[in-house]
Interface confidence: medium
């Protein structure tokens, strides 16, 4: 093999190259030196590098590596960030539409209930939004609160409209009676089942996307070890010390170095693959009662059916409640107010099913397909980075970390590096703590995704019957019990054309009792959860 050419006597070439990295500083020797103080670019003869230059090269090499890693993950990162934002906003839009449909149902069918109903509906859907975003709210409590609040109004306005003002002190009793007498039949339980299943899946879907971003962000901002910095310096910069400015590293050598540097990151691969496949499984199961769009946009109809159920049994109920709540204590009636702005367009709500709309469901599947093209992202990283940094083609006339070689031999390179640095040791060190943490988070989300009670294939949720739903409450297929009937009812069959909606300002609905603007209740931690961070002052 040809001996490496000596650097020029004045180290001019090396100096001019180094000046680009570190302008102004005179760290380059004036003439080639023995370089006995060097620790990375161990010379075989005189060198134009100093210890200070070596340190600068190491720093630059690590920065280069970080930039390469960031550019490698840019497309994937953008894909997940964009979709997480799109879905979060789309879910907000679904919630807003569902709220408006429900308000419209009350306005069209039960105008006497509207002031209070709007308020209760608004609170319910605000909680739905917060739940999706991760708030610690119990779905059953949300549904119970909705029906608990609605019943006193239904009783006093629809069933007993002649009730004198003095009788309005029975609210608490009516709230209690609502559950005890099952005045809405099994509709509340049905809604609980549908809403909790669909929201749970929606919430974990968003959680998983956000974790995906966290995974990429973590690996994106990894700080590479000093050992890795030395290997990179040897590969990219030590050739400069010998005046070899135009020579490129050998491709095979680059792969060895990258696998060493990325050993920890590559450990994510197994869990990343599982993450994408588990997410795919989740998405495949997001239909019917596991699809919040389907469930929430049909809620108005189920609520309407539930009120009709009450009206059907009004005679019997009025008698029972008359006895039960005769001696309630005085209690002021809850104040109610009209929202300023309902944004209800009856024409829009009457729209029939529109074919070929882009639905949330198709968007989810599209995302999964794109994500699957990144399933080998972590295992392929070393190769990707080498292919996107300068390496010699065909491993001919290239730099192997010590010298210029005609052909790269991994064995020779390893032998030559033994006394400098052990690649095997680097691999054995295990992943960085941040990588271990992100692996733990991936394991956790994968477990959550796997354990979600999702429908396997097209199985009807007949177990709802076992939970005590009366067949008369809905149609034959309980989990499709969403699009109720009733004269003058609005049929909502079409899925949201949510992408068109995204341009629509989410905060337009900001009227009292109708507000979907997230207030800081989505700060989903409480003081008493925080106490884990410090000694617990709880009594």
């Amino acid at each position: 093999q040809p001996p490496p050419p000596p650097p020029d006597a004045t180290c001019h070439q090396v100096r001019s190259f180094f000046q680009r990295l570190q302008p102004g500083l005179k760290w380059v020797p004036e003439t080639p030196v023995p370089g006995s103080d060097l620790q990375v670019c161990l010379p075989k003869g005189p060198t134009c590098c100093s210890r200070k230059m070596e340190e600068k090269y190491q720093l630059t090499a690590r920065l280069n590596m970080e930039q390469l890693l960031q550019s490698a993950s840019m497309e994937l990162k953008f894909l997940i960030i964009q979709n997480a934002a799109v879905f979060q906003e789309a879910f907000e839009i679904v919630v807003r539409h569902a709220k408006n449909y429900t308000n419209a149902m009350f306005k069209n069918n039960y105008p006497s209930l509207t002031p209070q109903a709007f308020e209760f509906v608004g609170e319910f859907f605000t909680d739905v939004s917060l739940y999706i975003l991760g708030s610690d709210i119990n779905v059953d409590d949300m549904v119970n609160e909705l029906f608990d609040s609605l019943f006193p109004v239904i009783y006093t306005q629809l069933m007993n409209p002649g009730l004198p003002d003095s009788a309005l002190d029975i609210n608490e009793c009516l709230r209690g009676a609502r559950r005890d007498l099952k005045v809405f039949g099994n509709f509340p339980k049905l809604i609980m089942t549908q809403v909790s299943k669909s929201l749970q899946v929606t919430r974990i879907f968003l959680q998983a996307l956000n974790l995906g971003i966290e995974v990429i962000n973590t690996t994106d901002h990894l700080k590479f070890s000093k050992d890795c910095g030395r290997m990179l310096t040897r590969m990219w910069y030590c050739s400069y010390c010998q005046g070899l400015m135009m020579v490129k590293p050998c491709g095979g050598y680059c792969n060895v170095v990258m696998q060493g540097c990325m050993a920890g990151v590559v450990e994510i691969d197994k869990y990343w693959r599982e993450y994408i496949l588990s997410l795919e499984e989740l998405v495949n199961g997001m239909y019917r009662i596991y699809d919040m769009e389907n469930v929430l946009l049909g809620l108005f109809s189920t609520i309407h059916d539930s009120i009709q159920y009450v009206q059907k049994n009004a005679g019997k109920l009025t008698t029972t409640i008359g006895k039960l709540c005769a001696h309630s204590q005085q209690r002021q009636y809850r104040s109610a107010y009209y929202p300023e702005d309902l944004f209800i367009d009856k024409k829009v709500l009457k729209v029939a099913h529109v074919e070929h709309e882009e639905t949330l469901s198709s968007r989810r599947r599209e995302l999964i397909q794109k994500l699957k093209s990144f399933i080998s992202f972590y295992s392929a990283l070393p190769g990707y980075i080498c292919s996107h940094s300068p390496v010699a083609e065909n491993d001919t006339l290239c730099w192997n970390g010590q010298e210029l070689v005609e052909r790269y031999s991994q064995k020779a390179a390893r032998n030559g590096m033994k006394n400098q640095f052990n690649l095997h040791e680097l691999k054995m060190k295990g992943p960085e703590p941040v990588v271990s943490q992100i692996i733990d988070k991936l394991k956790h989300i994968n477990q959550l995704l796997r354990t979600m009670s999702m429908p396997k294939g097209r199985v009807l949720d007949k177990n709802l019957d076992e939970e005590g739903f009366e067949s008369g409450d809905c149609g034959d297929d309980e989990d499709e019990c969403i699009g109720g009937s009733g004269d003058g009812m609005i049929k909502v069959k079409n899925q949201l054309r949510f992408l068109a909606e995204l341009a629509y300002d989410l905060d337009v609905d900001d009227a009292p009792g109708n507000s979907q603007q997230a207030t800081p209740k989505d700060n989903e931690i409480s003081t008493f959860h925080n106490l884990g961070n410090v000694h617990s002052p709880l009594k």
Epitope: N523, E524, I525, S526, N530, K539
Partner: antibody, heavy 115, light 112 residues
Framework: QVQLQQSGTELVRPGASVKLSCKAL????????MHWVKQTPVHGLEWIGA????????AYNQRFKGKATLTADKSSSTAYMEYSSLTSEDSAVYYC????????WGQGTLVTVSA | DVVMTQTPLSLPVSLGDQASISCRSS???????????LQWYLQKPGQSPKLLIY???NRFSGVPDRFSGRGSGTDFTLKISRVEAEDLGVYFC?????????FGGGTKLEIK
């Protein structure tokens, strides 16, 4: 809408105790923590502690432990802070504020400790 | 306790100017759930503090869009793009992640 109504100004003697009240309106009292904050020109805003009216759980700043006692009455949707062994250092405006993020505050109660 | 350091103490501005207030915490305010619990408030003389921004950058309802918050970990900034007369008062930052919760010392925004 959400409102927190605090009791009026208090002028008290050193060594005495005072019980401040904070009535919650416009939301479900038991769903949110109520926090108390002290404000003086010297120390600025200081977090005293919090109570969860639903569970009765309390958390205190060590600096105010033994000085402040937080309670809540669910039936009247009112939170209370009893402040004992008063000294001139305790002259301040005391606020109740609803977690999360302290989006809603009472109007404040001025306590003046003077012989 | 987590110390919240606000700078400057006083900020004289002309109406229509941009104002920027800094808040630094002695520990990272990132919770294990990924959220950063840093709030900004405005207190006008004789009034209670009013929430402007929560979780670093989220504007509370009714807060004009000239108010914006940014930052991460331990360094945070509140910006007012065009100061109006109604914006004058004392601005506080606070953290609600470590008990005891703590507030910054305040920055007084006043007319030059």
């Amino acid at each position: 809408q959400v409102q927190l109504q605090q009791s009026g100004t208090e002028l008290v003697r050193p060594g005495a105790s005072v019980k401040l009240s904070c009535k919650a309106l416009g939301y479900t009292f038991t769903d949110y923590e109520m926090h108390w904050v002290k404000q003086t020109p010297v120390h600025g805003l200081e977090w005293i502690g919090a109570i969860h009216p639903g569970s009765g759980d309390t958390a205190y700043n060590q600096r105010f432990k033994g000085k402040a006692t937080l309670t809540a009455d669910k039936s009247s949707s009112t939170a209370y802070m009893e402040y004992s062994s008063l000294t001139s250092e305790d002259s301040a405006v005391y606020y109740c504020t609803r977690f999360y993020s302290y989006a809603y505050w009472g109007q404040g109660t001025l306590v003046t400790v003077s012989a | 306790d987590v110390v919240m350091t606000q700078t400057p103490l006083s900020l004289p501005v002309s109406l229509g100017d941009q104002a920027s207030i800094s808040c630094r915490s002695s520990q990272s305010l990132v919770h294990s759930n990924g959220n950063t619990y840093l709030q900004w408030y405005l207190q006008k003389p004789g009034q209670s503090p009013k929430l402007l921004i929560y979780k670093v950058s989220n504007r509370f309802s009714g807060v004009p869009d000239r108010f914006s918050g940014r930052g991460s970990g331990t360094d945070f900034t509140l910006k007012i793009s065009r100061v109006e007369a109604e914006d004058l008062g004392v601005y506080f930052c606070s953290q609600s992640i470590y008990v005891p919760y703590t507030f910054g010392g305040g920055t007084k925004l006043e007319i030059k």
